[in-house]
């Protein structure tokens, strides 16, 4: 229905609390470099605004759309060329031009010193004296830092983040207690940040259908007892909601999430057995919830789905009178039969079944044609399969660290024109999955593994989008969504690169890595590894092994010794030379 | 995980019967759509037959319909393959196989766990 003022609609749904957070996270994430204060300012000003037209829906401005009275706060705001260039151009533009401008203009890797956490008892005093401002920090901090965040999920981080503190704060040994559960929470919404960008990215490159059709066979691997009709109505709302917050429109989105979460709780018999714990929940628990809910039990006996998609001689018929809907009810049909598939794998087998009806729809026997579509799965099926079992294998054989090294040099082999740090990054995100996926049961590693994988190469692409350096990550990126991550695995040594040339500094250290937290200390031996690899992208795994193990224990023996200056100064050259004569 | 063990294999003359039997341990057998494959020597393994969690649907290759019968005994955790009317062509080394997921039941990459197998050898 529609409301004479959007913004009272808006507030009166979410209450004021829900609104100001969700107005400081849409500015935070379109106006990146501004400071919490400036941000704080303008929230309350657009509240007060909101109260206005909430006590009269008439009063002037009221019935202006949301963009409208957002950008034009946002170029309201003094010095904003000065502090964001061109940005500011999409200030001269109209609705909804201007609202695309500034989409268009959020970095995804900004120039913002790492979010570093205070320590307990500075963190407990600011929360004690004002939560709502030291929420409202978490969420400027958070939402500047990943533009792309799923609004009214950083709102859930939020309130477990204030949960946390409240309970913590409480205690003797304050650090112990807040220090593993803030790790658990920053942790989960590192993998909610990618994951959300990714379905922006979807959304963004290839439109409402190649997302729906995500939704579709993500939500029928969850609901495998809901039909088609309910599974395609909530394919349709979740579209809804997560183009709304791609596209920056957060209160809506918001508030649609709600609909959607009180519509699944309103329907849990044609939807699904599991929802009820997650109904009992308050509204942010409960939407959380639903978004992770376990799988439903499967219904047993299912039949073969070849009756109806292979065997059928109106297969074709079928297809040419309603595309989508045929290819919907296979995407279906495939993926509540397949919870232990990842809905990359349930992409590409529906779009090798299109594939293949669109070419044997147009010859003279199409059953003799289509028939051989199951022979045609099977290389699909295992190379993810063999994926998995490779790398978990690796994984339990190396650990953590010794994994995102082995995933490290492989990386920087396929793509040595890529920065360090960007390689860096993204082999100890793609590392991780071994410590995330590799200890699930047998039939949750492949959907964990595989989409978790998806969700970080998206930003490795993204990265890469901004200064494109390497013809193969190029290559990889710019084909679909679902088979990027197959495109990488494929990807071998380039042969094009000319090999760094040795640099003494880029393998000099200092006293001060041995102060430094374990995590910093990795990355400065993973930032090493990586440049040994530039320079020797042939280099064999046992010559960079005995060179990492050498440096391993070069810094242990010089942080341990009474002079760390001075060891580090007459050791490291030597070092230096070994390394070299290792890798000659 | 799952173990598969198969029995009841053995020379036979065409036109004689045999029933094959693979007994299962270690999973909920119920939960498992269980398959037949064989494998003749040289050739490809192939779909022989499968039965779904209840025994509510069967599937079996053209070349053995009317012939063979699958079923299952979810009390005993066994699945069965009564062969008819055999002939030389069937001799195979037969495997049983169980699956959690499966959308075709006759593709052999959907079945996670394998048993040993069982020489079927039909010869006059």
């Known amino acids: 229905e529609a409301h004479k003022s959007e913004i009272a609609h808006r507030y009166n749904d979410l209450g004021e609390q829900h609104f100001k957070g969700l107005v400081l996270i849409a500015f935070s994430q379109y106006l990146q470099k501004c400071s919490y204060d400036e941000h704080a300012k303008l929230v309350q000003e657009v509240t007060d605004f909101a109260k206005t037209c909430v006590a009269d829906e008439s009063a002037a401005n009221c019935d202006k759309s949301l963009h409208t009275l957002f950008g034009d706060k946002l170029c309201a705001i003094p010095n904003l060329r000065e502090n964001y260039g061109e940005l500011a151009d999409c200030c001269t533009k109209q609705e909804p031009e201007r609202n695309e401008c500034f989409l268009q203009h959020k970095d995804d890797n900004p120039s913002l010193p790492p979010f570093e956490r205070p320590e307990a008892e500075a963190m407990c005093t600011s929360f004690k004296e004002n939560p709502t401002t030291f929420m409202g920090h978490y969420l400027h901090e958070v939402a500047r830092r990943h533009p792309y965040f799923y609004a009214p999920e950083l709102l859930y981080y939020a309130e477990q983040y204030n949960e946390i503190l409240t309970q913590c704060c409480a205690e003797a040994d304050k650090e112990s207690c807040l220090t593993p559960k803030l790790d658990g929470v920053k942790e989960k919404a590192l993998v909610s940040s990618v994951r959300q960008r990714m379905k922006c990215s979807s959304m963004q490159k290839f439109g409402e259908r190649a997302f729906k059709a995500w939704a579709v066979a993500r939500l029928s691997q969850t609901f495998p007892n809901a039909d088609f009709a309910e599974i395609t109505k909530l394919a349709t709302d979740l579209t809804k909601v997560n183009k709304e917050c791609c596209h920056g429109d957060l209160l809506e989105c918001a508030d649609d999430r709600a609909e959607l979460a009180k519509y699944m709780c309103e329907n849990q018999a044609t939807i699904s057995s599991k929802l009820q714990t997650c109904c009992d929940k308050p509204l942010l628990k409960k939407a959380h919830c639903l978004s992770e809910v376990e799988h439903d039990t499967m219904p047993a006996d299912l039949p073969a789905i070849a009756a109806d998609f292979v065997e059928d001689q109106e297969v074709c018929k079928n297809y040419a009178e309603a595309k989508d809907v045929f290819l919907g009810t296979f995407l279906y049909e495939y993926s509540r039969r397949h919870p232990d598939y990842s809905v990359s794998l349930l992409l590409r087998l529906a779009k090798k079944y299109e594939a293949t009806l669109e070419k044997c729809c147009a010859e003279a026997n199409p059953p003799a044609c289509y028939g051989t579509v199951l022979a045609e799965f099977q290389p699909l099926v295992e190379e993810p399969k063999n994926l998995v079992k490779t790398n978990c294998d690796l994984y339990e054989k190396l650990g953590e660290y010794g994994f995102q090294n082995a995933i490290l040099v492989r990386y920087t082999q396929k793509a040595p024109q890529v920065s360090t740090p960007t390689l860096v990054e993204a082999a100890r995100n793609l590392g991780r999955v071994g410590t995330k996926c590799c200890t699930l049961p047998e039939d949750q590693r492949l959907p964990c593994v595989e989409d978790y994988l998806s969700a970080i190469l998206n930003r490795v692409c993204l990265l890469h989008e901004k200064t494109p350096v390497s013809e193969h990550v190029t290559k990889c990126c710019s084909g679909s969504l679902v088979e990027r991550r197959p495109c990488f695995s494929a990807l071998t040594v380039d042969e094009t690169y000319v090999p760094k040339e040795f640099k003494a500094e880029t393998f000099t250290f200092h006293s001060d890595i041995c102060t430094l937290p374990e995590k910093e200390k990795q990355i400065k031996k993973q930032t090493a590894l990586a440049e040994l690899v530039k320079h020797k992208p042939k280099a064999t795994a046992e010559q960079l092994k005995t060179v990492m193990d050498d440096f391993a224990q070069f810094l242990d023996t010089c942080c341990k010794a009474a002079d760390k200056d001075t060891c580090f100064s007459t050791e490291g050259p030597n070092l230096v030379t070994r390394c070299k004569d290792a890798l000659a | 995980e799952v173990q598969l063990v198969e029995s009841g294999g053995g020379v036979v003359q065409p036109g004689d019967s045999l029933r094959l039997s693979c007994a299962a341990s270690?999973?909920?057998?119920?939960?498992?759509?269980m398959g037949w494959f064989r494998q003749a020597p040289g050739k490809e393994r192939e779909f022989v037959s499968a039965?779904?969690?209840?025994?509510?649907?069967?599937y079996y290759a053209n070349s053995v319909k009317g012939r063979f019968t699958i079923s299952r005994d979810n009390s005993k955790n066994t699945v069965y393959l009564q062969l008819n009317s055999l002939r030389p062509e069937d001799t195979a080394l037969y495997y049983c196989?169980?699956?959690?997921?499966?959308?075709?039941?006759?593709?052999?990459?959907?079945?996670?766990?394998w048993g040993q197998g069982t020489l079927v050898t039909v010869s006059s």
């Open positions: 196989a169980a699956s959690r997921f499966t959308s075709w039941y006759t593709a052999d990459y959907e079945y996670d766990y």
């Open positions: 270690g999973g909920t057998f119920s939960t498992y759509v």
């Open positions: 039965i779904s969690q209840n025994s509510i649907h069967t």
